[in-house]
């Protein structure tokens, strides 16, 4: 806490400029009017204040706006934003995408800090949902943003926002998240033709059910192995050898290299060895010829 002392004669700041870097902490406190600072906040970013001086400037704004800063100040915080705590940010009401962008720019190229996470949370909650423009902005700054949300939070993403999602934005998503995103993507891209649809939906297929994979196998999509390996195991298991062959097209040969990994390994165990042999890939581990396969789960469901 900086003591309240009178400003020395002739030192009262008329504007926020570089002369202030020569002020001691107490002089800044005494000689800089908080309202002046608020209106000329954008100038702070061009002045090499010390860390201690920044603390004084922040303290002045905190005193002027005890309930939280107005958006006109927030938008021009610049690197002073990095001095804010999550508690400070929780008091803010940020509604403008421009303000959000300005603050994200300050932290650009670095992992999401607690300050940024709190800011985004406040912004999204204020909007009520993750609209396309917001998602566009957030994934541009933080490609992993979408996958940092819980399935519950993802449920507020409208299907129209899915158009903003790039494949790399989904790299770190787990199956639970893709389960939520896939139906939204299916809805968003439903009016596209076959090949275009597949290009768009491909990144989301980790959440696709068996019936959708079966449908895709009828469309000559030539799914690559990397995509196939990300499919839900429970969705892949019921697929026949013929369906997998159609789904993968020329990429089917890649199954051999993945035969020890899920979901390929588990799928092989469910197929007749005869059927696997028709692929000519030397896949082993299928059900030997002459064995009867009872689907006990189906039997339980019927009873």
């Amino acid at each position: 806490e900086v003591e309240k002392t009178a400003c020395p004669s002739g030192k009262k700041a008329r504007e926020i400029d570089e002369s202030l870097i020569f002020y001691k902490k107490w002089e800044l406190e005494a000689c800089v009017d908080a309202a002046l600072l608020a209106t000329q906040m954008d100038r702070v970013n061009a002045i090499p204040f010390t860390y201690e001086q920044l603390d004084v400037l922040k303290h002045k704004l905190d005193e002027l706006y005890p309930q939280g800063y107005p958006e006109s100040v927030i938008q021009h915080l610049g690197y002073l934003f990095l001095k804010m705590s999550p508690e400070d940010i929780r008091k803010w009401n940020v509604t403008s995408l421009e303000t959000l962008k300005a603050l994200l720019e300050v932290n650009k190229g670095h992992e999401m800090s607690p300050q940024v996470a709190t800011l985004i949370d406040r912004f999204v909650k204020g909007r009520g949902q993750l609209d396309k423009d917001t998602l566009d902005t957030l994934t541009a700054f933080y490609p992993g943003y979408l996958c940092s949300l819980s399935p519950e939070e993802l449920s507020s993403v409208p299907p129209s926002s899915i158009w903003a999602v790039r494949p790399q934005d989904l790299d770190t998503c787990d199956p639970r998240q893709l389960d939520v995103l896939y139906p939204k993507a299916r809805l968003a891209f439903q009016n596209m033709n076959g090949s275009e649809y597949f290009v768009k939906i491909q990144s989301f297929l980790g959440g696709a059910p068996t019936e959708d994979l079966k449908a895709l196998s009828q469309q000559n999509v030539s799914m690559d192995l990397a995509t196939f390996m990300k499919l839900r195991t429970d969705a892949v298991l019921p697929l026949t050898v013929a369906e997998v062959q159609k789904l993968l097209g020329p990429h089917v040969e890649g199954l051999k290299a993945e035969e020890r990994h899920r979901p390929v390994r588990d799928w092989i165990l469910r197929q007749r060895q005869d059927d696997l042999d028709t692929l000519g890939l030397g896949l082993q581990g299928g059900i030997p010829n002459g064995y009867l396969v009872l689907d006990l789960s189906m039997q339980e469901a019927l009873s």
């Epitope: 061009a46 002045i47 090499p48 204040f49 010390t50 860390y51 201690e52 001086q53 920044l54 690197y79 990095l82 001095k83 705590s85 300050v106 932290n107 190229g109 670095h110 800090s113």
Partner: antibody
Framework: QVQLVESGGGVVQPGRSLRLSCAAS????????MNWVRQAPGKGLEWVAV????????YYADSVKGRFTISRDNSKNTLYLQMNSLRAEDTAVYYC????????????WGQGTLVTVSS | DIQMTQSPSTLSASVGDRVTITCRAS??????LAWYQQKPGKAPKLLIY???SLESGVPSRFSGSGSGTEFTLTISNLQPDDFATFYC?????????FGQGTKVEIK
Amino acid sequence: QVQLVESGGGVVQPGRSLRLSCAASGFTFSSDGMNWVRQAPGKGLEWVAVIWNDGSNKYYADSVKGRFTISRDNSKNTLYLQMNSLRAEDTAVYYCARDRGPLWPLDYWGQGTLVTVSS
Amino acid sequence: DIQMTQSPSTLSASVGDRVTITCRASQSISRWLAWYQQKPGKAPKLLIYKASSLESGVPSRFSGSGSGTEFTLTISNLQPDDFATFYCQQYNAYSRTFGQGTKVEIK
């Protein structure tokens, strides 16, 4: 006068960890930011990391992100660099250096401590 | 990340010469640029900050200029003590990047 003294360097095997320290005196340590900069033998300077005066913000060069952690103890006037998963290319003299604000240069430097990563 | 490119990498000069080293940033850094001098086995020493401000105690024969992406360090009257390696460095709120260095050697 300002003094920065690094310690903790030595020979370490690839994959192992090491912690460097930098003891500061002659200035108000808790008021200033601190950096680590390294210099591989016969090479140029490479900035490694910065930590703000109160420890609230830490930033790293891409080459060490996820492996190195910068920290400070203001009560002990000491800066640290925890280096994990060390690689041969981390071999260098490591300097600590002070900055007075986010838009300040590195005005005081220690004499450095040598870290050699070799099997 | 902001890249800093220095030229030349080596410079041969004689005592009394005027020497100029240039530094180019991959994007605008305003005037947030420093110059350092380093002698073998020693820590770097700050010469110039904010592109043209002379650090206290540094001889006035050293000067800096430039803004945005193009910067220069000039030594107006090279002295025997000035033969060393010089580095430019950009600095901002969360990172610093050095140029690869310019070695000034005796011709």
